[in-house]
Interface confidence: medium
C-alpha cells in the first residue's frame, strides 16, 4: 500500500494576513487564525513529518480584502510560490479582472500548475492563453505519479468577468476525456480538484469514472468528523464518502474557507490505484500554531503599500452620504441607494440578446450600512472612509429566490418598524410600498420590481411564483438579521465580491456620485 | 481581552444630576451598541436605553426620556450615562451592557462591573 | 410595554436536579429573548439568547426553549456553582424589560 497526504484549501479570498475567528480584521493577535504565514508552518511540519504531501488549492484565492484591490493577483502568485504549492484549480474569482488580470500576475508568475479541464479558449485568446492553464498534471510524488485534473463552476460568466473567448463547459462531460487520458498514460491515482461547490463534486465523485478523490471549493462548506474546533457546523462528515456509479467509495473534501483551516486527508492506495482507506481532518489554524517568522516579515514588507493606498482618493461625492442609524434603519438613505446601485453595476453581465441584464434587483439591510460620508471634506471618498461604512468584511453574493419568499422579507424588513434595527432593508431595482398601520406581517402593500428580460427596464409587479436573482450580502443570505427566510428558501447562492471593494470600484469608475433619495421605499399616506 | 470598566460609586442630593462613565477596551468600541441598565438593592434589572457610537444615535426607555442623556466619546471608547432631577428610589447599581450592533442576534454579551448610585438628602 | 412574567420567583433544589424556569411576555417576542445568570455582586452573565442559542463558553446543561410568549430555561442537573438569581429579557420592541427574576438557592 503506497500512502498520500492531501493538504488543501479554497475560498481563501486574500486572507493574506491571520483574521478573526469570523475571519474579518484580526484584533486581538493571541485569538487571531489562518494566514499564510501561519499555514507554511503547518505545512512545513507536515512535509517533514510525511513522505508522500501534496498542497493543492480549489480556487478563489482571488478577491475579498484590500490585498486583491491593490495587489491584484501578485500577492496570491507570490505567497502561493513561497509556500510552494503544488497545484491550483481556477476558481470563478480568478476571473474578477477579466481574462488579462488572471493571466499576467497569476498564470505566468505561479511556479505550480494551474488547473480547469473545463474552460475552452477559443478566437485570439487561445493561442495568447495556451499552455497558462492545463486540464491536468501529472505530478510526481515520491516514486509514484498522482493526476490532478481541475474544473471550474460553469457558472462562471454569470459571476465574473471571464469575457467572451472563454467557453465553461458541463463538468463532468469535460472531465471524464481529461481523466480517460489520464488512465491512458498508466497514471492510477487521480484527484479531481476544482471550484463548483459541493452538490457538483459529490455529482463528480458519482460520475466520472476513474476520479479517486475530490478536492472541492466554491461553497465554503465545513465538513468535519468528531468534534468541530470552532464555530463552524459541519455539513457531514470529512472525508464525505461517495459510492460512485461503479461501486467505489470516493472521498470528497472542502475546507470551509478564508485560510481558517487546513485540509488535511490522508489516503492509502493499493499498487493497482485503488483507495483503501481515507481519513483526516481539516486543522484549525489557530493561534496554537506560531506564525513563521521569514513569511511574516515578508507580508509586513507588502503590507506598507496597503497602508498608503487606504488614503488615498478613489472618486468624490458632492452630496451627503447618509449612512446614519436614524436614516438608513427607518426610510430610504442614499447611502444604501449608493451602494445597491453599485452592488447592480458590479454584476452587469450582458449574456443574453433577450435580457439588459442577468440580475436587476439588490436588497441590504439598513443595520449593515455603519456610517455616513460627509461631502465637506473637499468631497474626497477613501477606502479608509469606505471601510467605516462597511465594516465587516463581509461580499455582495447573487442568490435565487422565489417571489414569495421576496415578499416575506419585505415584511420582516418592517415586522418591528420603529425599533432602529437592523434588518430595514434598502434597496435597488425594487419600488416597496409599506402601510404601518396594517398588523406585522402584512404591511407591504406594494411590490415592484425592474424586469430584466426586456431592452427598456421598467417596474412590473413581484409574481410568487416567479424566480429572481438578487444581489444582497453574504449576511442577509446566511440568514442574519432574522432573514431565515432567505436562507431556508434561497434556490441557488454564489459568494460575489468584497463589499468594500464593489463600491469602491464603482465610485471610482463615476468618479463623481451624488445619490438621491428618490422613492425606492414608500410608506402610504397616514402610516408613516 | 474585551471588558467594560464604570467609575466609582457616587452619592448625590435629591434633585441633582450623575454621570457614570463606561470605558470599553478589547473590541472596536465604534461598532456595538453600548446600553445601560439599573438595578435597585434587591430587585430586577431594568433597561434605561442604548447609544450607537459610531454615529451618537440613542435609544431611551420613554420611563427616563428627558431625564437621561447617554453620549460617547469615541476617541477615548467611552460611554457616559447622565440621570438628571435624581430622587431617592433612583438608587441603584447602574451597569453599562454591550450589545452587538449588526450580526442580528440579540443580547448583552459584556457588562460594566457596575456602579453603585445612592441618593440620600 | 411588553411585560416579562417570571416563574416561580424563588426555587430550592439540590445538586444534580433538573430544574425549569419559565418567561411569560405580555405579547408575541419571537424567539428575541436572552437568559441571564446573576450572582450576588456581580454583573449579569449571558447564558442563551435568541430563546435557545447557547452563549460561547456556556456549560450545555443549560438550554432554552419556546416561543410566542411563553419561554423556559432548563438546567439539566444542578451544579454548585449554578446557584444564583435568573433573568430573562425580551428584545422584540422597547423598551426592552427584563423578567423579575428567579432566585435558585440549595435546599
Known amino acids: 500500500a503506497w500512502e498520500l497526504t492531501i493538504l488543501h484549501t479554497n475560498d481563501v479570498h486574500s486572507r493574506l494576513e491571520q483574521t478573526s475567528e469570523d475571519s474579518s480584521k484580526c484584533v486581538n493577535a493571541s485569538r487571531c487564525m489562518g494566514g499564510v504565514a501561519r499555514l507554511f508552518t503547518k505545512v512545513q511540519q507536515i512535509r517533514r513529518a510525511e513522505p508522500n504531501v501534496l498542497l493543492l488549492d480549489a480556487g478563489d484565492q482571488y478577491q475579498g480584502t484590500i490585498w486583491f484591490t491593490v495587489y491584484k493577483g501578485a500577492e496570491v502568485a507570490h505567497f502561493m510560490n513561497a509556500l510552494r504549492y503544488d497545484a491550483m484549480a481556477l476558481g470563478n474569482h480568478e476571473f474578477d479582472n477579466g481574462v488579462e488580470g488572471l493571466i499576467e500576475p497569476l498564470l505566468k508568475e505561479a511556479k505550480f500548475p494551474i488547473l480547469s479541464a473545463n474552460i475552452k479558449a477559443k478566437g485570439p485568446l487561445a493561442s495568447q492563453i495556451s499552455g497558462l492553464y492545463l486540464p491536468y498534471k501529472v505530478l510526481p510524488v515520491g516514486d509514484e505519479v498522482v493526476g490532478i485534473v481541475g474544473y471550474t463552476s460553469k457558472e462562471t460568466p454569470f459571476l465574473s468577468n471571464p469575457g467572451t473567448n472563454l467557453v465553461f463547459e458541463d463538468e463532468i462531460t469535460a472531465l471524464q476525456p481529461e481523466v480517460d487520458k489520464l488512465k491512458t498514460l498508466n497514471v492510477n491515482k487521480i484527484i479531481a480538484l476544482g471550484h463548483s461547490g459541493f452538490e457538483m463534486d459529490k455529482l463528480i465523485a458519482q460520475k466520472v469514472r476513474g476520479v479517486d478523490v475530490v478536492v472541492g471549493g466554491h461553497s465554503n462548506t465545513f465538513l468535519y468528523t468528531g468534534n468541530p474546533p470552532s464555530k463552524e457546523v459541519p455539513a457531514g462528515k470529512y472525508p464525505f464518502i461517495v459510492t460512485s456509479d461503479d461501486g467505489r467509495k470516493v472521498p470528497v473534501v472542502q475546507a470551509y474557507a478564508f485560510g481558517k483551516y487546513l485540509g488535511y486527508l490522508k489516503i492509502e492506495f493499493d499498487e493497482r490505484g485503488n483507495v483503501i482507506s481515507s481519513h483526516g481532518n481539516p486543522i484549525l489554524l489557530n493561534s496554537s500554531i506560531p506564525e513563521d517568522p521569514s513569511i511574516k516579515a515578508d507580508i509586513n514588507k507588502w503590507r506598507i503599500k496597503l497602508d498608503n493606498y487606504s488614503t488615498q482618493e478613489l472618486g468624490k461625492t458632492i452630496v451627503y452620504l447618509d449612512g446614519s442609524s436614524q436614516s438608513c434603519r427607518f426610510r430610504e438613505c442614499n447611502m444604501g441607494n449608493l451602494i445597491c446601485d453599485a452592488m447592480i453595476n458590479n454584476n452587469l453581465r450582458h449574456t443574453d440578446e433577450m435580457f439588459w441584464n442577468h440580475v436587476s434587483m439588490c436588497i441590504l439591510n439598513g443595520g449593515g450600512i455603519r456610517s455616513p460620508i460627509d461631502e465637506r471634506n473637499n468631497g474626497t471618498i477613501t477606502w479608509e472612509n469606505l471601510a467605516a461604512v462597511l465594516p465587516f468584511g463581509g461580499t455582495f453574493d447573487l442568490v435565487q429566490l422565489k417571489g414569495s419568499t421576496l415578499k416575506k422579507a419585505f415584511e420582516h424588513s418592517v415586522h418591528r418598524y420603529g425599533q432602529s434595527t437592523g434588518e430595514f432593508l434598502q434597496v435597488g431595482g425594487i419600488h416597496v410600498v409599506y402601510d404601518l398601520s396594517r398588523k406585522p406581517g402584512d404591511r407591504v402593500v406594494k411590490l415592484d420590481v425592474l424586469c430584466t428580460k426586456c431592452r427598456v427596464p421598467s417596474y412590473d409587479p413581484l409574481k410568487m411564483d416567479e424566480v429572481y436573482k438578487v444581489i444582497l450580502p453574504n449576511f442577509l443570505a446566511n440568514g442574519g438579521d432574522g432573514f431565515q427566510m432567505i436562507k431556508d428558501e434561497l434556490l441557488r447562492h454564489d459568494s460575489g465580491d468584497q463589499d468594500i471593494n464593489v463600491v469602491s470600484t464603482y465610485i471610482s469608475k463615476m468618479k463623481v456620485i451624488y445619490p438621491a433619495v428618490e422613492g425606492r421605499i414608500k410608506f402610504s399616506t397616514g402610516s408613516h | 481581552q474585551v471588558q467594560l470598566v464604570q467609575s466609582g460609586a457616587e452619592v448625590k442630593k435629591p434633585g441633582a444630576s450623575v454621570k457614570v462613565s463606561c470605558k470599553a477596551s478589547?473590541?472596536?468600541?465604534?461598532?456595538?451598541?453600548i446600553n445601560w441598565v439599573r438595578q435597585a438593592t434587591g430587585q430586577g434589572l431594568e433597561w434605561i436605553g442604548w447609544?450607537?457610537?459610531?454615529?451618537?444615535?440613542?435609544k431611551y426607555n420613554e420611563k427616563f426620556q428627558g431625564r437621561v442623556t447617554i453620549t460617547v466619546n469615541t476617541s477615548i471608547s467611552t460611554a457616559y450615562m447622565e440621570l438628571s432631577s435624581l430622587r431617592s428610589e433612583d438608587t441603584a447599581v447602574y451597569y453599562c451592557?454591550?450589545?452587538?450592533?449588526?450580526?442580528?442576534?440579540?443580547?448583552?454579551?459584556?457588562w460594566g462591573q457596575g456602579t453603585t448610585v445612592t441618593v440620600s438628602s | 410595554d411588553i411585560q416579562m412574567t417570571q416563574s416561580p420567583s424563588s426555587l430550592s433544589a439540590s445538586v444534580g436536579d433538573r430544574v425549569t424556569i419559565t418567561c411569560r411576555a405580555s405579547?408575541?417576542?419571537?424567539?428575541?429573548l436572552a437568559w441571564y445568570q446573576q450572582k450576588p455582586g456581580k454583573a449579569p452573565k449571558l447564558l442563551l439568547y435568541?430563546?435557545?442559542t447557547l452563549a460561547s463558553g456556556v456549560p450545555s446543561r443549560f438550554s432554552g426553549s419556546g416561543s410566542g410568549t411563553d419561554y423556559t430555561l432548563t438546567i439539566s442537573s444542578l451544579q454548585p456553582e449554578d446557584f444564583a438569581t435568573y433573568y430573562c429579557?425580551?428584545?422584540?420592541?422597547?423598551?426592552?424589560?427584563f423578567g423579575g427574576g428567579t432566585e435558585l438557592e440549595i435546599k
Open positions: 435568541n430563546a435557545k
Open positions: 429579557q425580551h428584545f422584540w420592541s422597547t423598551p426592552w424589560t
Open positions: 478589547g473590541y472596536t468600541f465604534t461598532s456595538y451598541d
Open positions: 405579547g408575541n417576542v419571537h424567539n428575541y
Open positions: 447609544i450607537y457610537p459610531r454615529d451618537g444615535f440613542t
Open positions: 451592557a454591550r450589545k452587538e450592533g449588526y450580526r442580528g442576534d440579540w443580547y448583552f454579551d459584556v
